[in-house]
Structure formats: C-alpha cells, structure tokens
C-alpha cells in the first residue's frame, strides 16, 4: 500500500457526515487520516468496528489478519460469514460485512504477504464479491497488479464462491479442498493459495500436514508457510462497478 | 465546538454507586465515539471505558469491569457511566472525551473534545 496519508483535524469536516461512515474510504473523503478501529455502518447494515488503514491512496478495510497463530482459522461456514477473532490481532472480518461494505460495486482488493525472512510482497486486485445467494463468489474484473501472474487467482472474469469445510463450493469435483487443507477460502483446484490456512510456527516435515499452511504458490511456493498475511478492501466509485 | 459536560459526581461510601453523565452539545452526537476517563491525585489520566457512536460497541479497564457499565442515549446527547461497588481506588476526577466518526480507542490521545471532569470520592 501507499504510504501513510498526511494528517487532517477531522474537525475541520464534521459537518460533512451527519451518520455514521458506510467505510473506511468514506472516512477518508471527509477528512480522518489516522488509521485505527472505527464503526462504520454500511447502507441496509447494523453498525460494526472495523480496521481502517488510512493510505494516500484513501482508506481501506482490513478484512484478514494473521500474524502469530493465536486464532483457530479452521472454522465452518457461518463462522467465516459472521466474522471470529480478535480486532487487535488476527481476525477474519466476516463475508456478509465485507460483501455489506462492497455491495455491488467493484473493488480493489489488496494482499500483502510476509516471509519468515523479512521479505514481503503487495498484490492487488481488482475484484467484485458476491452475495451469499453466490457463496461469496470472488471474480476478478482486472489483471492482477505485481510481477506474481494470472496463476496465483482464478483467471480474469472466472468466478471462485468461497467455500469451508462444512460448504464446499470449490471447483474440484473429487475433492473437498477446505476439508483436505484448512480454514475457508476462495478455493479453485486447491493449489493456488490458502491465506486461511493453518498457522505454522516451524516447517513440518510432512508434505501432507504442510499443504494445510498458509501459502501462496506464486510467491513463496506451494508448499512455504507464510508468516504474516493481511487483506484489505476498498470499493470503487459506484460508476466504476460493472 | 463540541462542549462537553459531566455531572452525578460526588462523595459516597465504599460499595456505593454513582451515575455520571455526559452532556453534549451537538446535532450529530451519534456519530460521537465517547469515551471515559479518570486522574487520581498524583497519578496520570487513564482509560475507563468507551461506547460508540450507535451504543452498538464498549469496552472498559480490567479495573472497573463489572463493576461500571456505560451507556448513551442519543436522543438526549448524552452518555451515562454506572458506577457499582465503589472502592476507594476510584477516587479520582472523571473526564468524558468525544471523537468524531467513531473511533475505537482507549488512548486520550485520540479525542478531540473534552469535559471539565467531576469529582468522584469514595470514602472507605
């Protein structure tokens, strides 16, 4: 992501926004540059806290987080829908939050990726997410942004649903890839990435118990567990949705 | 200019109760995210509790929890703090602390606006 954002006295603006904020890139626009946990309140939603990381290029929602290992990511589908874990640490905001932040518009969706050896790597994407009624389906509306290729996420126009290992809507006939790895994900044939899934502290030995890491194959490998991984999301101008 | 104002402080015995309220002066007061906190003789301010701008959302100090629950009613630009099984450790000065567009955060550093505080003392 771009660097911090210049600072702005948020109290210059406040009789521009006479309701709560629908997200963090709102917040943005009527002037709060400082990143930190914020209720917005996105249009037909209760109210609920969110990450909002305050960039120059506008302000964006965190929607994961891992970092440590503290949090069990293998959870069933309405886990993965409501949202679980800690807003201070690791934590998956919820599919029916980000898909009430989203609407029907597109976004930019940015991931950025640690190793265990310091190195890190920013993708971003431009994506629209579906509704339940499409099982959360994550369909790219643009190439990818990074040097990573087409092969680390479904092809552009092709829609994955996200699946748990209690709702498998993955596009592998013969396999269930969240029951035979780990967490919920946007699943294809099981091999692209997994940034939901089992946190390893050290590199098992066993091939078997390793796909069940966090991973994205065109980075680090199929099969190298990531240390640290974080999504945001920010939802383009309404005009720009397709 | 957001104008804050606390009142319900005063004297009580230990294991006493005390509602605080915080009055504030502005159209939009749901989008307050507001914030208690409190200085001790001698001691730096700290953090007590928060609520959101909806009420959806609060938190307190390991100190206080279970003891004091905070609320608000929008309509009334006003957020209470209930005080329950007062010790003499929570003797201090109470500050209501406003932020606009909600922010979540126990650091002052975080407010905008500010009350004059009221005076708590309990007496063991």
């Known amino acids: 992501l771009p660097e911090m954002a210049q600072p702005v006295d948020p109290a210059h603006n406040v009789s521009r926004l006479h309701r709560l904020p629908r997200d963090c890139q709102e917040l943005f626009q009527v002037g709060e540059r400082q990143s930190g946990l914020f209720e917005i309140q996105p249009q037909g939603s209760p109210p609920f806290l969110v990450n909002c990381k305050m960039t120059s290029d506008g302000g964006w929602t965190v929607i994961q987080r891992r970092h440590d290992g503290s949090v069990d990511f293998n959870r069933p589908w309405e886990a993965y829908k409501a949202g679980f874990g800690d807003p201070h640490g690791e934590f998956w905001l919820g599919l029916e939050k980000v898909h009430s932040i989203t609407g029907d518009r597109n976004s930019r969706l940015a991931v950025q990726l640690r190793d265990w050896d310091g190195n890190a790597e920013l993708l971003q994407f431009s994506v629209h997410l579906g509704g339940e009624d499409t099982a959360y389906s994550l369909q790219l509306t643009a190439p990818v942004a990074g040097q990573l290729g087409a092969t680390t996420v479904p092809p552009s126009g092709l829609s994955v649903p996200f699946s748990t290992w209690d709702q498998d809507h993955d596009l592998r006939r013969d396999k269930n890839c969240a029951k035979s790895l780990s967490g919920g994900w946007w699943f294809g044939t099981c091999s692209h990435s997994n940034l939901n899934g089992q946190y390893f502290r050290s590199i098992p030995q066993q091939r078997q118990k390793l796909k069940k890491g966090i991973f994205w194959k065109t980075w680090r490998g199929r099969y190298y567990p990531l240390q640290a991984t974080t999504m945001l999301i920010q939802p383009m101008a309404a005009e720009a949705a397709s | 200019e957001v104008q804050l104002v606390e009142s319900g402080g005063g004297l009580v015995q230990a294991g006493g109760s005390l509602r605080l309220s915080c009055a504030a002066s502005?159209?939009?007061?749901?989008?307050?995210?507001v914030g208690w906190f409190r200085q001790a003789p001698g001691k730096e301010r700290e953090f007590v509790s928060i609520?959101?701008?909806?009420?959806?959302?609060?938190d307190y100090a390991d100190s206080v929890k279970g003891r004091f629950t905070v609320s608000r009613d929008n309509a009334k630009n006003t957020v209470y703090l209930q005080m329950n099984s007062l010790k003499s450790e929570d003797t201090a000065v109470y500050y209501c602390a406003a932020r606009h567009w909600g922010m979540f955060s126990r650091s002052e550093n975080d407010y905008n606006y500010w009350g004059q505080g009221t005076q708590v003392t309990v007496s063991s």
């Open positions: 609520i959101t701008g909806s009420g959806t959302y609060n």
């Open positions: 502005v159209l939009t007061f749901g989008t307050y995210t």
